[in-house]
């Protein structure tokens, strides 16, 4: 008996071939001997089966002795043995219809679980193997689960169902809802303007939800809500904004905020959360602000940084085109009685300069100038 695998919702074509290459009488029946379709001369006739409106044949092939049964919009319950009667012969074809669906929505928040469920006909014992967009293979029986979805899991999942050494392939598009970056860090000199961007890693036609940016300044004992906003069909509307700092937020995606100037009291970490309509849980992006200040007070030249810096970052003070006078893994460095000239304060990571502030030290009878 020939076995054919089909996919729920698809169309299948079961073949039936006569030895004579001409149009002769044929009938297709199911295992209950109920006629599905056949011919009467050049006319297609249909029987009383449940497939009535979904069954068809290809009349153009009859003259070649081919009498296919075409079943459209396959259902799991279409799984059956189909019998083609032609030239006093009976050809049997076993059709097994499978369906693979994501248990929940195919738009899932980062960190959530994806469950794929296989619908299969009674008596079948299929195995399933799925390959994620990042090349990870998972195997299972009737259900497959992937916990802690990551951004790289967004895309087309290819699942292969194996039964009777035959296979059928399913493709499921999964969208992982997340920000492009889990965390970002902005380095600024005191007084510079700050821009925070929160690009999303997905695109959907209509995006609705609400969000908030909480800020934990390094100098503050508790965190503070800087801004709350709504998102309706990709349009951002600010609901409430703190008066200090005077934040501005763009009305279009990607989410974008500007801070008029970087000040030591703003240095710290923020957490932007976005709750999407009809989704449980929230999207998160952490943003960090590091602020640098170089000052000269009397005979002391000081360079300080505020904000979340890693212990391996190096803070240095050097006279332009000379070796560093002082270089430490600390958040403040200073030079007593600095020579006149252009001094540079550098925050660097493994030799790569992240932030630089210049200060001009004038001869001792003058006051310093910050360019």
């Amino acid at each position: 008996k020939k076995v054919v695998l089909g996919k729920k919702g698809d169309t299948v074509e079961l073949t039936c071939t006569a030895s004579q290459k001409k149009s002769i009488q044929f009938h297709w029946k199911n295992s209950n001997q109920i006629k599905i379709l056949g011919n009467q001369g050049s006319f297609l006739t249909k029987g009383p089966s449940k497939l009535n409106d979904r069954a068809d044949s290809r009349r153009s092939l009859w003259d070649q002795g081919n009498f296919p049964l075409i079943i459209k919009n396959l259902k799991i319950e279409d799984s059956d043995t189909y019998i083609c009667e032609v030239e006093d012969q009976k050809e049997e074809v076993q059709l097994l219809v499978f369906g693979l669906t994501a248990n929940s929505d195919t738009h899932l928040l980062q960190g959530q679980s994806l469950t794929l469920t296989l619908e299969s006909p009674p008596g079948s014992s299929p195995s399933v193997q799925c390959r994620s967009p990042r090349g990870k293979n998972i195997q299972g029986g009737k259900t497959l689960s992937v916990s802690q979805l990551e951004l790289q899991d967004s895309g087309t999942w290819t699942c292969t169902v194996l039964q009777n050494q035959k296979k059928v392939e399913f493709k499921i598009d999964i969208v992982v809802l997340a920000f492009q970056k889990a965390s970002s860090i902005v380095y600024k000199k005191e007084g510079e303007q700050v821009e925070f961007s929160f690009p999303l890693a997905f695109t959907v036609e209509k995006l609705t939800g609400s969000g908030e940016l909480w800020w934990q300044a390094e100098r503050a004992s508790s965190s503070k809500s800087w801004i709350t906003f709504d998102l309706k069909n990709k349009e951002v509307s600010v609901k409430r904004v703190t008066q200090d700092p005077k934040l501005q937020m763009g009305k279009k995606l990607p989410l974008h905020l500007t801070l008029p100037q970087a000040l030591p009291q703003y240095a710290g970490s923020g957490n932007l959360t976005l709750a999407l309509e009809a989704k449980t849980g929230k999207l998160h992006q952490e943003v960090n602000l590091v602020v640098m200040r170089a000052t000269q007070l009397q005979k002391n030249l000081t360079c300080e940084v505020w904000g979340p810096t890693s212990p391996k970052l190096m803070l240095s003070l050097k006279l332009e085109n000379k070796e560093a006078k002082v270089s430490k893994r600390e958040k403040a460095v200073w030079v007593l009685n600095p020579e006149a000239g252009m001094w540079q304060c550098l925050l660097s990571d493994s030799g790569q300069v992240l932030l630089e502030s210049n200060i001009k030290v004038l001869p001792t009878w003058s006051t310093p100038v910050q360019p």
């Epitope: 303007q193 349009e235 509307s237 600010v238 501005q248 763009g250 009305k251 279009k252 974008h256 500007t258």
Partner: antibody, heavy 117, light 107 residues
């Protein structure tokens, strides 16, 4: 043809009221934010107010807040600007403009409002 | 509110000249900036949207550039019909703000 036609301008005394209308045609009015922009004689352009597609959100320039009200009737493809407590500095040509989300792209020919005693 | 500073306020040039008008935002506005042309007694006309995208039907001699705080409108080779007043518009957030305008006159 995409078109915006303003009406309702005229001469009004300080403290008086006026209602401007804008008739839209040639596009799906209910799919767009709409805007009023004004231009005082010999001066530059000033954004006045915006209204969302369904009228649920409205924004105004500070100088007209509490005096002007933007509204719309999607069934009639019409935009309105109710102007109360008018001042001499409100004298301007008022333009009805379509907000395409990334630009103010279609402008009416404007209607003149003169506030004078 | 974010302020927009347009310069120069007026400019004299000749047909065939290359002309540049600048607009500066007091805070970063990404590329949420448009350029308009207005002729006397007429409504403004959209030239450039999203800082650098040319509006359909606008001649290619007009171009826009910039992002963040500094933006430029360039007319590569002035034509007689280009003598008009030009405005930038910030539509990053509310309130929308126009630049003060640049009057482009024949030298």
């Amino acid at each position: 043809e995409v078109q915006l036609v303003e009406s309702g301008g005229g001469l009004v005394q300080p403290g008086g009221s006026l209602r401007l209308s804008c008739a839209a045609s040639g596009f799906t009015f209910s799919s767009y934010w709409m805007t009023w922009v004004r231009q005082a004689p010999g001066k530059g352009l000033e954004w006045v107010a915006n209204i969302k597609q369904d009228g649920s959100e409205k924004y105004y320039v500070d100088s007209v807040k509490g005096r002007f009200t933007i509204s719309r009737d999607n069934a009639k493809n019409s935009l309105y600007l109710q102007m109360n407590s008018l001042r001499a500095e409100d004298t301007a040509v008022y333009y009805c403009v379509r907000d395409r989300y990334d630009a103010l792209d279609i402008w009416g020919q404007g209607t003149m409002v003169t506030v004078s005693s | 509110a974010i302020q927009m500073t347009q310069s120069p306020s007026s400019l004299s040039a000749s047909v065939g000249d290359r002309v540049t008008i600048t607009c500066r935002a007091s805070q970063g506005i990404r590329n949420d900036l448009n350029w308009y042309q207005q002729k006397p007694g007429k409504a403004p006309k959209l030239l450039i949207y999203a800082a650098s995208s040319l509006q359909s039907g606008v001649p290619s001699r007009f171009s826009g550039s910039g992002s963040g705080t500094d933006f430029t409108l360039t007319i590569s080779s002035l034509q007689a019909e280009d003598f008009a007043t030009y405005y930038c518009l910030k539509d990053y957030n509310y309130p929308y703000t126009f630049g003060q305008g640049t009057k482009l006159e024949i030298k």
